[in-house]
């Protein structure tokens, strides 16, 4: 038995920040779980982790230097990533593991979300400003 995950196919981070919502075919209420967001086709970089259980406040952390926060819904976890760089444009995968109560469950690999980071730009100067007037 596997949990199914739905994510937006693509998101654009205009201001170097983005909300990525991971929707699960499973209710996380009163479960102990570990939701994570992974970067790259091989999911090699664990961007952010949201750890939840019944007795503690939600724990959100990144061990890879990302600025992230997380919010929990009954069947979703939303990752809020800030201070993204243009070169962090990539595909991002949601992952979920439910440990308690048993049984242990994890998810079928999702299709992922391409996050396109658009850098902050100043107002562009016109390409052809025309002749300057005296």
């Amino acid at each position: 038995n596997k949990i199914l995950v739905k994510q937006s196919p693509m998101l654009v981070a205009y201001d170097n920040a983005v909300n990525l919502s991971c929707k699960y075919s499973y209710n996380l209420f009163s479960r102990e779980f570990r939701a994570s967001l992974h970067k790259g086709l091989d999911s090699a970089v664990e961007v952010c982790v949201v750890y939840g259980n019944y007795s503690q406040q939600l724990q959100v952390y990144s061990k890879t230097g990302f600025n992230c926060d997380g919010k929990l819904g009954n069947e979703s976890v939303t990752f809020y990533l800030q201070n993204l760089y243009v070169n962090q444009t990539d595909i991002y995968f949601c992952k979920i593991e439910v440990m308690y109560p048993p049984p242990y469950l994890d998810n079928e690999k999702s299709n992922g979300t391409i996050i396109h980071v658009k850098g902050k730009h100043l107002c562009p100067s016109p390409l052809f400003p025309g002749p300057s007037k005296p």
């Epitope: 009163s30 259980n53 019944y54 440990m99 308690y100 109560p101 048993p102 049984p103 242990y104 994890d106």
Partner: antibody, heavy 118, light 111 residues
């Protein structure tokens, strides 16, 4: 037949580490969670942690900073490493399989006695 | 952590006796209709052996004289007619919440 065979007894100095192995046979190792439990001499059972079929691990909060559980699917072997050993870690260490998915442990290794002594 | 308290800590009984061991959890171990409470038998120098899982399901190969009952916080292991090979220590275990915990054990001795 279905079995878990553990490595032999170890005598260790305080502050050192120990790594206990648990080799599975007779079942598809990669389909099951393996849990580790210890028992100090004359005492009850204490859960150490587990490794799930996905490769993810989960540890008892009291031992989390010192324990590492790993698995090698190619050899159907699980490992439990405990660092910064102290005398209170002297115990028989067991690996066990969770078959029903409810973390009830149906097959156990024979146990490995780890003695920590200076 | 969920505390499991077994009673009695030890008991003396004769072959053929009906023996009852109780296990009380510090909070409910039920979820979605399942009680995550399991019973083990351990003999000296041996690994524990699973007898009952999910409060009342008899493990394959375990004699039918062993039975488990209960839900919520109160559970019972019953041996309907004690046999010579049943003299051992019995443990309950909960797996509803982490960390997994065990009762302190009940030693069944020969009277």
């Amino acid at each position: 037949q279905v079995q878990l065979v553990q490595s032999g007894a170890e005598v260790k100095k305080p502050g050192s580490s120990v790594k206990v192995s648990c080799k599975a046979s007779g079942f598809t190792f990669s389909s099951y969670a393996i849990h580790w439990v210890r028992q100090a001499p004359g005492q009850g059972l204490e859960w150490i942690g587990s490794i799930y079929h996905s490769g993810s691990t989960y540890y008892s909060p009291s031992l989390k900073s010192r324990v590492t559980i790993t698995a090698d699917k190619s050899t159907s072997t699980a490992y439990m490493e405990l660092s910064s050993l102290r005398s209170e870690d002297t115990a028989v260490y067991y690996c066990a399989r969770d078959v029903y998915g409810s973390y009830a442990l149906d097959v156990w290794g024979q146990g490995t006695l780890v003695t920590v002594s200076s | 952590d969920i505390q499991l308290t077994q009673s009695p800590s030890s008991l003396s009984a004769s072959v053929g006796d009906r023996v009852t061991i109780t296990c009380r959890a510090s909070q409910s171990v039920d979820f979605d209709g399942i009680s995550f409470l399991h019973w083990y038998q351990q003999k000296p120098g041996k690994a524990p052996k699973l007898l009952i899982y999910d409060a009342s399901s008899l493990e394959s190969g375990v004699p039918s004289r062993f039975s488990g009952s209960g839900s919520g916080t109160d559970f019972t292991l019953t041996i309907s007619s004690l046999q010579p090979e049943d003299f051992a220590t019995y443990y309950c275990q909960q797996s509803y919440r982490s960390p997994i915990t065990f009762g302190q054990g009940t030693k069944v001795e020969i009277k």
